[in-house]
């Protein structure tokens, strides 16, 4: 799991405990069983913008 207090990974990336850093989800094409790919698969689509306050 990501260390407490660290910034979340940016959009399109996911935390890798194996590498101890955020990884670009595009890397899952090379190695789909990498630990961070689970987070990429589970990542929701881009949040929609609310049209009301």
């Amino acid at each position: 799991e990501q260390a407490p207090g660290t910034a979340p990974c940016s959009r399109g990336s996911s935390w890798s405990a194996d590498l101890d850093k955020c990884m670009d989800c595009a890397s899952c094409r090379a190695r789909p069983h990498s630990d961070f790919c689970l987070g990429c698969a589970a990542a929701p689509p881009a949040p929609f913008r609310l049209l009301w306050p």
Epitope: A17, L19, M23, S27, A30, R31, P32
Partner: antibody, heavy 120, light 112 residues
Framework: QVQLVQSGAEVKKPGASVKVSCKAS????????IAWVKQAPGQGLEWIGE????????YYSEKFRGKATLTADTSTSTAYMELSSLRSEDTAVYFC?????????????WGQGTLVTVSS | DIVMTQSPLSLPVTPGEPASISCRSS???????????LYWYLQKPGQSPQLLIY???NRASGVPDRFSGSGSGTDFTLKISRVEAEDVGVYYC?????????FGQGTKVEIK
């Protein structure tokens, strides 16, 4: 250029241990996986396990769990594989290989291999 | 574990002629992302394995275009359009879908 240079051939007695090294150069050692592969005489390739050098996290084949121990020293960019309780069936050439985790291309680089002979 | 099975295990070839090696996996190597995680390696005599083909059909850097990979799911083929003397060695298929990383038994290609 990327290079993996392994330690020299070893002859060991049954029951002994051996530690094989794999020195990496030409890239950032902590950014890639180092895998270890066994090739017994006249046989095929068998994955032993792999290590993430930056964190020391390891994954092992069930067959080699307890037989092989993988470590890495980031200060010297060197990966190690120790084999314990050696038996005649451990006689083989052992390869280290750099495996990518980036983008599409699985551009493996392999060491030259280390022959371990177990003989009384 | 995914079991990789190659055929033939021995392949005598004539320089200039085509050659073909088959590989079958015990489960599909086609990921939901559309990629087949099948790889081909060549181990020349006295050398380390070298990557020829990655993700079923992509040639690795420096690999001549006489080598090609095809297939899908569980059945794959490596083709050499015109065999050259330097192509002798043992060819292995392998997968990269999950751990453990497993290889076929190898196909020994030798000149007739």
């Amino acid at each position: 250029q990327v290079q993996l240079v392994q330690s020299g051939a070893e002859v060991k007695k049954p029951g002994a241990s051996v530690k094989v090294s794999c020195k990496a150069s030409g890239y950032t050692f902590t950014d890639f996986i180092i895998a270890w592969v066994k090739q017994a005489p006249g046989q095929g390739l068998e994955w032993i396990g792999e290590i993430y050098p930056g964190t020391g996290r390891t994954y092992y084949s069930e067959k080699f769990r307890g037989k092989a121990t993988l470590t890495a020293d980031t200060s010297t960019s060197t990966a190690y594989m120790e084999l314990s309780s050696l038996r005649s069936e451990d006689t083989a050439v052992y390869f280290c290989a750099r495996r990518t985790i980036y983008y599409d291309y699985d551009g493996d680089y392999w060491g030259q291999g280390t022959l371990v002979t177990v003989s009384s | 574990d995914i079991v990789m099975t190659q055929s033939p295990l021995s392949l005598p070839v004539t320089p200039g002629e085509p050659a073909s090696i088959s590989c079958r996996s015990s489960q599909s190597l086609l990921h939901s992302n559309g990629i087949n995680y099948l790889y081909w390696y060549l181990q020349k005599p006295g050398q380390s394995p070298q990557l020829l083909i990655y993700q079923m059909s992509n040639r690795a850097s420096g690999v001549p275009d006489r080598f090609s990979g095809s297939g899908s799911g569980t059945d794959f083929t490596l083709k050499i359009s015109r065999v050259e003397a330097e192509d002798v060695g043992v060819y292995y298929c392998a997968h990269n879908l999950e751990l453990p990383w497993t290889f076929g038994q190898g196909t020994k290609v030798e000149i007739k």
